[in-house]
């Protein structure tokens, strides 16, 4: 028997459209074969309509096509405008139609239910709007204009020219008669209910010169778009309800188990706190439309999600709303990396972000997560060197250890860094992935002077103390840039007096600049890694000054100052939002950080050779 | 919340038929496809046949060990499927469950179903 399974019956009426699908074993050899979609003829031949190499048919152009889903293992056929004409049997299959893997399926296509000749056909979506065209004559323009509904053998007047209107449809309904010479009037049904369903008859005068019209109106529920993600992705559900809508309050909600929706996130400021962090609804186009991107995908996530607009923000019966089923993915490409990174005032941290590594070129950015209203996220940090301006000397984006990582640096800690934070690219918007920084009691590893003043021409010696754990590490000074950290030479110099109890092993690593140049000016950082993968950080400002007296400057940390005040500098926010989130070239203009000099501060930071330590643990 | 309450099975003969039927009341308006699924004693409970909808499309699919004598319809007025099952085997004694679902990703698997009934107890004597 074929492992190769579908639907054996499909039915339908004509002028619709069918979405065959079709399920094979999703081996690598199965997810890359050839698919299609054959009709089996009076000689036993089945002849190709529609294949995954691009090939249609004739008879299917502009109304078929044959979608693969490799990481399901499923692919699926769509067919449109269907006619009696497509009824009859068939093969969905992978390799060569004689004699691949196949399933047969059998469509049949009926005309459907028999309306009343000329009757127009109204399909349209649970919630939404639609217009009814009822022509007449001249003689019935000033006659009563009229709009039935047929309920078996009766007929249900709804609306008329009188003013009347059904309790059924009040509030919701209108009926426009034009001006002079236009012969036909419309009536405007909003907010359509599944019950609205049904044959109604336009009526213009009465006896038996009326003018009258049939309609029939399908409405539909929506058919939810299934969605699969990778667990500790991300997924944007894009929700265009029309312009009639465009003014409602819009919401995300979730159907749980007693076939309610609860309210994932809506325009009116509410938001589930099992979304924290990880939500945002990005504002909506003129047309109404609108975004809602999650991140950090968990198992629990899935389920229906429904889209929609009220004015209580939730969902309510006979408004329009959109579908989706999500399935999260537990064989996920994204790899693991910590959600919650901690760090103590004062210290740093480093954050690994993933990014699909087919994508190596793409633009990186960091953005920090603001809950407020609909929630929002201003770029900190991008791989091109823009830093937002409060952020100066403290952040930096590293693009090691590379092949698919990425590393954020933000030290100088204040409670104000805890909060969640959003990796993302300007590529796959799948691998937006969010990490939340916790501010936790305690000291700094590193210790560095807070403020140095440098003398022009002259020699700066600045010391790094790092504690026995960080021995087997490689240390390294840096001097840093809006474009990112260059590390500079260093030297480790033997014990440090900072952590008694470390006896031998506690050691200091210090940062010569000889002779001082006023490209030094700015901040340095020091810092420990293990290969690619960044550890602490300490950064110290160095500003320099014209010379007074002459001599070397040796900073301790017992002389050493506070640390300077950050710069805070108005700026306009760079933010995820509309299409800025597929696209972060499109946000905002801002200003950017000066770049400060000559990243390698030129070439006179040296290290001290007279030293009996070996260079091989320090960065070079 | 959707229940479902099956009806029809009962003790036949080997060559006759039975007709069951599952009725759904509740919230049906997510419920997508509807179907069936029968366990044998000490056996997994195992895929029957299952119909899914869209509009006026209905997309009904089959176990191999059914195909040609069993079918599913359903009645949407009436929010209820049925199966009518032709040219029974013993083979074919098991409980018959109804199961529901708001969206299938493979109508095999008894996983992808959200609601279940309780089930109704075929038996076919040789």
């Known amino acids: 028997k074929s492992p190769v399974f579908g639907p054996q019956e499909v039915s339908s009426v004509e002028g619709n459209s069918v979405s065959i699908k079709c399920y094979y074993p999703p081996t690598s050899v199965n997810r890359h074969t050839r698919k299609y979609w054959c009709r089996k003829g009076a000689s036993g031949r089945c002849i190709t309509l529609v294949s995954s190499e691009g090939y249609v048919s004739s008879n299917y152009a502009g109304r078929a096509n044959l979608t693969n889903f490799p990481e399901n293992g499923t692919f699926v056929v769509n067919i449109a405008q269907l006619s009696r004409d497509d009824s009859g049997h068939y093969k969905c299959g992978l390799g060569i139609n004689s004699r691949g893997l196949s399933f047969d399926v059998s469509l049949e296509v009926s005309q459907g239910p028999e309306l009343p000749n000329g009757t127009e056909v109204y399909t349209v979506d649970v919630g939404r709007t639609v217009t009814i065209k009822c022509p007449f004559k001249t003689e019935n323009a000033p006659k009563t204009k009229a709009l039935y509904k047929k309920i078996g053998q009766t007929s249900v007047l709804v609306i008329d020219s009188r003013n009347y209107v059904n309790p059924n449809y009040k509030d919701r309904i209108r009926l426009r008669i034009p001006g002079t010479g236009q012969l036909i009037f419309t009536v405007v049904i909003d907010r359509l209910r599944l019950s609205d369903h049904g044959l109604y008859l336009c009526q213009a005068g009465d006896g038996s010169n009326r003018d009258e019209k049939n309609a029939d109106l399908q409405v539909l529920e929506p058919e939810p778009e299934l969605v699969y993600e990778d667990l500790r992705g991300s997924v944007t559900f894009h929700c265009a309800l029309g312009l009639e809508v465009a003014n409602v309050a819009k919401f995300l909600c979730r159907v749980n188990s007693r076939e309610t929706c609860d309210v994932v996130i809506n325009t009116l400021g509410k938001r589930d706190s099992a979304f924290e962090g990880r939500i945002l609804l990005n504002p909506q186009d003129k047309d109404g439309s609108f975004s809602v991107v999650i991140t950090g995908l968990r198992k629990e996530d899935e389920g229906r999600y429904l889209c929609g607009a009220h004015s209580d923000g939730q969902l309510q019966e006979g408004w329009p709303i959109q579908a989706w089923q999500l399935f999260v993915n537990e064989e996920s490409t994204i790899p693991r990396s910590p959600t919650v990174v901690k760090g103590v005032a004062g210290g740093s941290v480093a954050v690994l972000c993933p990014y699909n590594p087919k994508e190596s070129q793409s633009l990186k950015y960091w953005c920090l997560w603001e809950g407020a209203q609909n929630g929002r996220c201003p770029l900190l940090v991008e791989s091109q060197g823009l830093v937002q301006e409060q952020y100066e000397g403290r952040l930096s984006l590293l693009q090691e250890p590379g092949n698919g990582t990425f590393t954020v640096i933000l030290n100088q800690l204040t409670t104000q860094d805890a909060g969640f934070y959003w990796c993302l690219t300007n590529g796959d918007t799948r691998w937006r992935t969010t990490v939340e920084i916790k501010i936790i009691e305690g000291e700094p590893n590193l210790k560095v002077p807070g403020n140095v003043t440098a003398v022009l021409g002259e020699t700066l010696n600045i010391p790094c103390h790092f504690p026995c754990k960080f021995s087997s590490y490689e240390k390294y000074w840096c001097k840093w840039s809006n474009t990112g950290c260059q590390t500079l030479p260093s030297q480790d110099e033997g014990p440090s007096e900072a952590f008694v109890n470390c006896d031998e092993n506690s050691r200091l690593v210090s940062l010569t600049l000889n002779p001082v140049t006023r490209a030094d000016e700015g901040w340095y950082w020091c810092g420990v890694k293990q290969g690619h993968f960044y550890g602490e950080t300490a950064a110290v400002y160095v500003a320099v000054e014209e010379k007074k007296v002459a001599g070397s400057r040796y900073v301790s940390p017992a002389k050493a100052d506070a640390a300077p005040d950050e710069k805070v500098l108005d700026s306009g926010v760079r933010e995820i939002e509309n299409k800025a989130i597929q696209d972060p070239r499109l946000f905002a203009e801002e200003k950017v950080v000066a770049d400060t000099g000559d990243q390698a501060g030129g070439s006179r930071a040296s290290v001290d050779s007279s030293s009996s330590e070996e260079q091989g643990g320090s960065s070079k | 919340q959707v229940q479902l309450v099956e009806s029809g099975g009962g003790l036949v003969q080997a060559g006759d038929s039975l007709r069951l039927s599952c009725a759904a009341s509740?919230?049906?308006?997510?419920?997508?496809?509807m179907g069936w699924f029968r366990q044998a004693p000490g056996k997994e409970r195992e895929f029957v046949t299952t119909?899914?909808?869209?509009?006026?499309?209905?997309?009904?699919y089959y176990a191999d060990s059914v195909k040609g004598r069993f079918t599913i319809s359903r009645d949407n007025a009436k929010n209820t499927v049925y199966l009518q099952m032709n040219s029974l085997k013993p083979d074919d004694t098991a409980v018959y469950y109804c199961a529901a679902s708001t969206v299938l990703r493979d109508p095999r698997v008894p996983t992808e179903y959200d609601y279940w009934g309780q089930g109704t107890q075929v038996t076919v004597s040789s």
């Open positions: 119909i899914t909808w869209s509009g006026s499309t209905n997309y009904k």
């Open positions: 509740g919230r049906t308006f997510t419920t997508y496809g």
